[in-house]
């Protein structure tokens, strides 16, 4: 696709005559017709296969034609073509006389031709104008012409389409031969590929616009050459994404388990000795007088209640001392000076001699315990009642007071709420965790199906022949009151026309 441009420069018709030699009156008001066509060895006026164009009246007799291209005018004349320029052409330029304003051929005088020129030859596409001058006995025409490609067409014959663009489909301008020339920062056959930031890692980085470096998953850094360790990796590094290679002294999946806790945290207090004992674990060996995981507690040796049989403990510099109650002795008051003769067993406990009377043991009745049966047993401490039942101590035994819906010694049995048939009018009962639910038959509603819901049996218009319908609320049925001339439960039979029976 291109344009043949013809620039008319000067026309000389000094005598102001037509081609026939007849003078124009008052002068030759001259306009031009241009016919561009395929190459002909002998140019004939036939069809203008490449196009035709006419000018307005440009002057009278002799005149120069001003270049009017900048003002959007008609010089140079434009003859566009939408095919591959063949490199050869024929051109006919006619000068005509128009006495009036109507330039149509049929409106011209029959001898309106002033001059005609016909040229043919080769013409390559290019910016340079070819200057030519044609002279006859009566006239002279000076003009120049060239062929240029239309916008977006390039090449020797304007056959290469190239439209500069700067969008998703490409970022380029067009070279004179129609090849693409990528805009700065773009590459590829159609200049669709951005050139990433210099140094951006070839595999791990990419970009959607020039001088950018976007990292693929697992990579980071300005040039996407640093791997991202496993999410949550605390004291570790990576050589490929999502790794967590632990630093020295750390372990575990996330390198967050301290294998050298003693050094990193010094957890043992009060001069205790620390020993690493695995991932994030350690053992403190306390100095005398200290206790606790980290030996943080000063040790009171009475804290372990070492004194038996009601002996009282006294802390001492080098340990403790038990003050025994009457009848007891020993380091921990563990030896009794009492015997069964002293009746040491309370609450009806039975005394049994031991070690040839040097010792005794009490056998306690139910509900009592202790070495002297001095403690009462609380039978409710083990919460024996199920389903929220309340435990009550009743002398030697206990009992459970159950919540509604439960029964049994320990309220372990669920009482069926449906057992007493609570749903009225044939409703179906369903046991639920927190009660019951009734599904009511048609015509009843309410929590226990106790409410009668009347059904309008007339709603379906069962009566024929404009009979009046009544609902029987006791049976939920309908009654049809027939108009004169009709009988039947639905007033469907006319009187005198009994139904036709098959017999």
């Amino acid at each position: 696709s291109g344009v043949f441009q013809l620039q008319l420069q000067e026309f000389i018709n000094e005598r102001g005559v037509l081609a026939s030699g007849r003078p124009c009156e008052p002068g030759c008001r001259t306009f031009f017709r241009v016919c561009l066509k395929h190459f002909q060895a002998v140019v004939s006026p036939g069809p203008c296969t490449f196009g035709t164009v006419s000018t307005p009246v440009l002057g009278t007799n002799s005149f120069a034609v001003r270049d009017d291209s900048s003002g959007g005018g008609r010089n140079p004349l434009q003859l566009p073509f939408n095919f591959t320029w063949p490199g050869t052409f024929s051109l006919i330029i006619e000068a005509w006389h128009a006495p009036g304003d109507d330039l149509r051929p049929e409106a011209l005088p029959p001898d309106a031709l002033i001059s005609k020129i016909a040229i043919q030859g080769s013409l390559a596409v290019g910016q340079n104008w070819l200057l030519d001058e044609q002279t006859s006995t009566l006239t002279r025409l000076r003009y120049s012409y060239r062929v240029i490609c239309s916008d977006n067409y390039y090449g020797d014959n304007c056959s290469r389409l190239c439209k500069k663009r700067n969008d998703h489909f490409g970022h380029y301008v067009c070279q004179p031969d129609g090849n693409l020339s990528c805009l700065p920062g773009w590459t590829g056959e159609y200049c669709q590929q951005p050139i990433c930031l210099s140094g951006c890692h070839e595999q791990n980085g990419y970009c959607s616009k020039p001088a950018e470096c976007l990292c693929r998953p697992g990579w980071q850094g300005r040039l996407c050459n640093e791997c991202i360790p496993h999410n949550g990796c605390r004291h570790g590094t990576c050589s490929t994404p999502w790794q967590c290679t632990c630093d020295e002294g750390w372990g575990g999946l996330f390198c967050d388990q301290d294998l050298n806790y003693c050094t990193h945290h010094s957890p043992c207090k009060n001069g205790a000795t620390c020993s690493n004992s695995g991932q994030r674990s350690y053992t403190c060996t306390c100095r005398p007088g200290y206790t606790g995981v980290d030996c943080e507690l000063e040790l009171s040796e009475c804290d372990s209640n070492p004194c038996r049989n009601g002996g009282s403990c006294k802390d001492q510099e080098d340990g403790y001392h038990c003050l025994c109650p009457p009848g007891y002795y020993g380091l921990h008051c563990e030896h009794s000076t009492l015997s069964c003769a002293d009746s040491p067993c309370f609450n009806g406990g039975s005394c049994r001699e031991r070690n040839q009377g040097a010792n005794y043991a009490c056998e306690c009745p139910p509900n009592f315990t202790g070495s002297n049966c001095e403690k009462k047993v609380d039978r409710c401490t083990s919460n024996p009642c199920a389903n929220g039942g309340q435990c009550l101590n009743r002398g030697p035994s206990r009992m459970c007071r159950c919540r509604p819906g439960f029964t049994g010694t320990y309220c372990e049995l669920h009482v069926s709420d449906c057992a007493r048939n609570p749903c009225a009018h044939g409703g179906t009962c369903h046991d639920l965790e927190n009660g019951l639910m009734c599904t009511c038959p048609a015509g009843f509603s309410g929590r226990r199906c106790e409410v009668r819901t009347s059904i309008d049996a007339c709603a379906s218009s069962p009566c024929f022949n404009r009979a009046t319908c009544y609902t029987d609320l006791s049976t939920d049925t309908f009654v049809c009151n027939c108009p004169y001339g009709f009988v039947g439960s639905r007033c469907e039979f006319p009187v005198g026309l009994p139904p036709s029976f098959p017999w």
Epitope: V17, L18, A19, S20, G21, R22, P23, E25, S44, P45, G46, W96, R104, P105, E106, A107, L108, P109, P110, D111, A112, L113, S115, K116, S136, T137, L138
Partner: antibody
Framework: EVQLVESGGGLVKSGGSLRLSCAAS????????MSWVRQAPGKGLEWVAI????????YSADSVKGRFTISRDNSKNTLYLQLNSLRAEDTAVYYC????????????WGQGTMVTVSS | SYELTQPPSVSVSPGQTASITCSAD??????VSWYQQKPGQSPVLVIY???TRPSGIPERFSGSNSGNTATLTISGTQAMDEADYYC?????????FGGGTKLTVL
């Protein structure tokens, strides 16, 4: 149908007069130049006169100048040729022809009317 | 006065090409028309503006004009093409016809 029909021809004595008419139909008569062309028996075509579409411009051959007058009535779609001072050499078939604008030539011709000048 | 010169007669065999010339000084600067006239009939325009055929004229009729000579060419001449042919141009006085050429199809 585009048509030109001449009339008014006949036998006339030398020095006499005739008025030829040409009735046009099938085209816009008032928009076209019209002409008269004659052909003597056994001879070639000879142009006689031509008139512009509005009658403002008239041209005639040197051989008939001052004797023949071309005119037109656009309201009647009719072309005329007034022949005065007729001579024997004016004997010919007179054709009425429509002239195409812009050097197209004469694209419509009538059937002709015979003018015979006797001495 | 301007004169258009034609040969009085041209003969051609059927199917052959006939060429009729029309000469005058610098005729190529003008547009030439050609007319066919058969005996007893009015002339008919067959070529105008050197080489253009009016509608209805067969393609075997063509024309050219350059220098001092215009040419009417009838290719594949048929018996029905036998007629008188006239060229026509303009001079300062008005319309000019050539003397005519009788085409005979043998």
């Amino acid at each position: 149908e585009v048509q030109l029909v001449e009339s008014g021809g006949g036998l006339v004595k030398s020095g006499g007069s005739l008025r030829l008419s040409c009735a046009a139909s099938g085209f816009t008569f008032r928009s076209h130049w019209m002409s008269w062309v004659r052909q003597a028996p056994g001879k070639g075509l000879e142009w006689v006169a031509i008139i512009s579409y509005d009658g403002s411009n008239k041209y005639s051959a040197d051989s008939v100048k001052g004797r023949f007058t071309i005119s037109r009535d656009n309201s009647k779609n009719t072309l005329y040729l007034q022949l005065n001072s007729l001579r024997a050499e004016d004997t010919a078939v007179y054709y009425c022809a429509k002239a195409g604008g812009g050097n197209v030539g004469f694209d419509i011709w009538g059937q002709g009317t015979m003018v015979t000048v006797s001495s | 006065s301007y004169e258009l010169t034609q040969p009085p007669s041209v003969s051609v065999s059927p199917g052959q090409t006939a060429s009729i010339t029309c000469s005058a000084d610098e005729l190529g600067t003008q547009y030439v028309s050609w007319y066919q006239q058969k005996p007893g009939q009015s002339p008919v325009l067959v070529i105008y503006q050197d080489a253009t055929r009016p509608s209805g004229i067969p393609e075997r009729f063509s024309g050219s004009n350059s220098g001092n000579t215009a040419t009417l060419t009838i290719s594949g001449t048929q018996a029905m093409d036998e007629a008188d042919y006239y060229c026509q141009a303009w001079d300062r006085s008005g319309v000019v016809f050539g003397g005519g050429t009788k085409l005979t199809v043998l």
